[in-house]
């Protein structure tokens, strides 16, 4: 139902990276506009994107005050310039979303290697532990400080003549890893929740290798 | 249910080559890790390689390296693992095995192993 | 390549005894050890996870212990089902290794 001029939205996906967290949808809309409702299953209902032209509307700010709760969307739609008109049944149209909960589902974000140190024969390679939209006190809490021991981080490591990628895993932000004297070797890190199923994995990393101006190097 | 089925083992001749497949079902292997062990008659456990079917990266022990090849089709879910040039010490039973991916659990499931004969 | 030296390669034992399996790794490697149990013909099954840590569905006869770079398995009662070969592997670098193995018999 609905009135002649309206369609429901369809193709309800969420988009979410480091729990900054959108809601996407089609059709892009001629002659109507949209508005997003979001709750928790045992909450209210909270407007949001109130009559927007937009296809996808920023859940952020809703999603962060509790990401391990489960949040269930709709998209409303409306005749454009009579906001006021319903469908048939004294209702506007609707659909829901999936349902999406941020701690289990928004996806992990490329990280970043903020540096490395080689002292002898051992690498200490840190890597950046990027914050998120989560706050805490006022205070944004960083990757590390929402997921704890659930984030754990792999690092793929290579001497430079080389392409077999060796590895190691650190539920820190920090690896030791032993490395052949006078050789040069190259890092790429992913971060990886291991108690998902899915999203388990983020991007790589980009490549960083000895010798450019990330590292240093101390002979000893 | 995860489950890991080997296939493509039989009997080759030295210097020969051989496709052996790995297929996966109850999870995605792009999400995990795959490795290859093998296991020679009455002998020990020998580990082979590894892919990340997510990047493609791969590493390979000394004994293998240059003659054998990871590689995974994630559309199929199925990791693979290339042999050539093959000598009779390659006489195994060949495992594959998913590696978990925490800081603490690796080969969590393995296959049930098929056996690569290499002999004239 | 960091080696895992594991002992006894074998022995004998009956229904109820305590059996202690060890293995040493080569140099340091934390707490990324694990333990498998193989019967004839099948393969390896997880124990033992991060040297200690006692496997979905394993049953708690079985235990890990660390001390340095010696590792410990512990089967406190043996029970018929026990009667296999069991391997250390560390996961600590690449590659993993795995130790010679322990087949545990019938006295």
């Known amino acids: 139902s609905g009135t002649t001029n309206t369609v429901a939205a369809y193709n309800l996906t969420w988009k979410s990276t480091n729990f900054k967290t959108i809601l996407e949808w089609e059709p892009k809309p001629v002659n109507q506009v949209y508005t997003v409702q979001i709750s928790t299953k045992s909450g209210d209902w909270k407007s949001k994107c109130f009559y927007t032209t937009d296809t996808e509307c920023d859940l952020t700010d809703e999603i962060v005050k509790d990401v391990k709760q489960t949040y269930l969307a709709r998209v409303f739609s409306y005749p454009a310039g009579n906001v006021e008109s319903t469908g048939s049944a004294g209702e506007p149209l609707y659909e829901n979303s999936p349902e999406f909960t941020p701690y289990l589902e928004t996806n992990l974000g490329q990280p970043t290697i903020q540096s490395f140190e080689q002292v002898g024969t051992k690498v200490n390679v840190t890597v950046e532990d990027e914050r998120t939209l989560v706050r805490r006190n006022n205070t944004f809490l960083s990757l590390r400080d929402v997921f704890g021991k659930d984030l754990i981080y792999t690092l793929y490591y290579w001497k430079s003549s080389s392409s077999g990628k060796k590895t190691a895993k650190t539920n820190t932000n920090e690896f030791l890893i032993d490395v052949d004297k006078g050789e040069n070797y190259c890092f790429s890190v992913q971060a990886v929740i291991p108690s998902r199923t899915v999203n388990r994995k983020s991007t790589d990393s980009p490549v960083e290798c000895m010798g450019q101006e990330k590292g240093e190097f101390r002979e000893i | 249910e995860v489950q890991l089925v080997e296939s493509g083992g039989g009997l080759v001749q030295p210097g020969g080559s051989l496709r052996l497949s790995c297929a996966a079902s109850?999870?995605?292997?792009?999400?995990?890790?795959i490795h290859w062990v093998r296991q020679a008659p009455g002998k020990g456990l020998e580990w082979v390689g590894y892919?990340?079917?997510?990047?493609?990266?791969?590493y390979y022990a000394d004994s293998v390296k240059g003659r054998f090849t990871i590689s995974a089709d994630t559309s199929k879910n199925t990791a693979h693992l290339q042999m050539n040039s093959l000598r009779a010490e390659d006489t195994a039973v060949y495992y594959c095995?998913?590696?978990?991916?925490?800081?603490?659990?690796?080969?969590?499931?393995w296959g049930q192993g098929t056996l690569v004969t290499v002999s004239s | 390549d960091i080696q895992m030296t594991q002992s006894p390669s074998s022995l004998s034992a009956s229904v109820g005894d305590r059996v202690t399996i060890t293995c040493r790794a080569s140099?340091?490697?934390?707490?990324?050890v694990a333990w498998y149990q193989q019967k004839p013909g099948k393969a390896p099954k997880l124990l033992i996870y991060?040297?200690?840590f006692l496997y979905s569905g394993v049953p708690s006869r079985f235990s890990g212990s660390r001390s340095g770079t010696d590792f410990t398995l512990t089967i406190s009662s043996l029970q018929p089902e026990d009667f296999a070969t069991y391997y250390c592997?560390?996961?600590?670098?690449?590659?993993?290794?795995f130790g010679q193995g322990t087949k545990v018999e019938i006295k």
């Open positions: 095995a998913r590696d978990y991916g925490s800081f603490r659990v690796q080969l969590d499931y």
């Open positions: 109850g999870f995605t292997i792009s999400q995990y890790w």
């Open positions: 892919i990340d079917p997510y990047n493609g990266y791969t």
């Open positions: 140099q340091d490697v934390n707490t990324a």
């Open positions: 991060s040297a200690s």
């Open positions: 592997q560390q996961h600590y670098t690449t590659p993993p290794t």
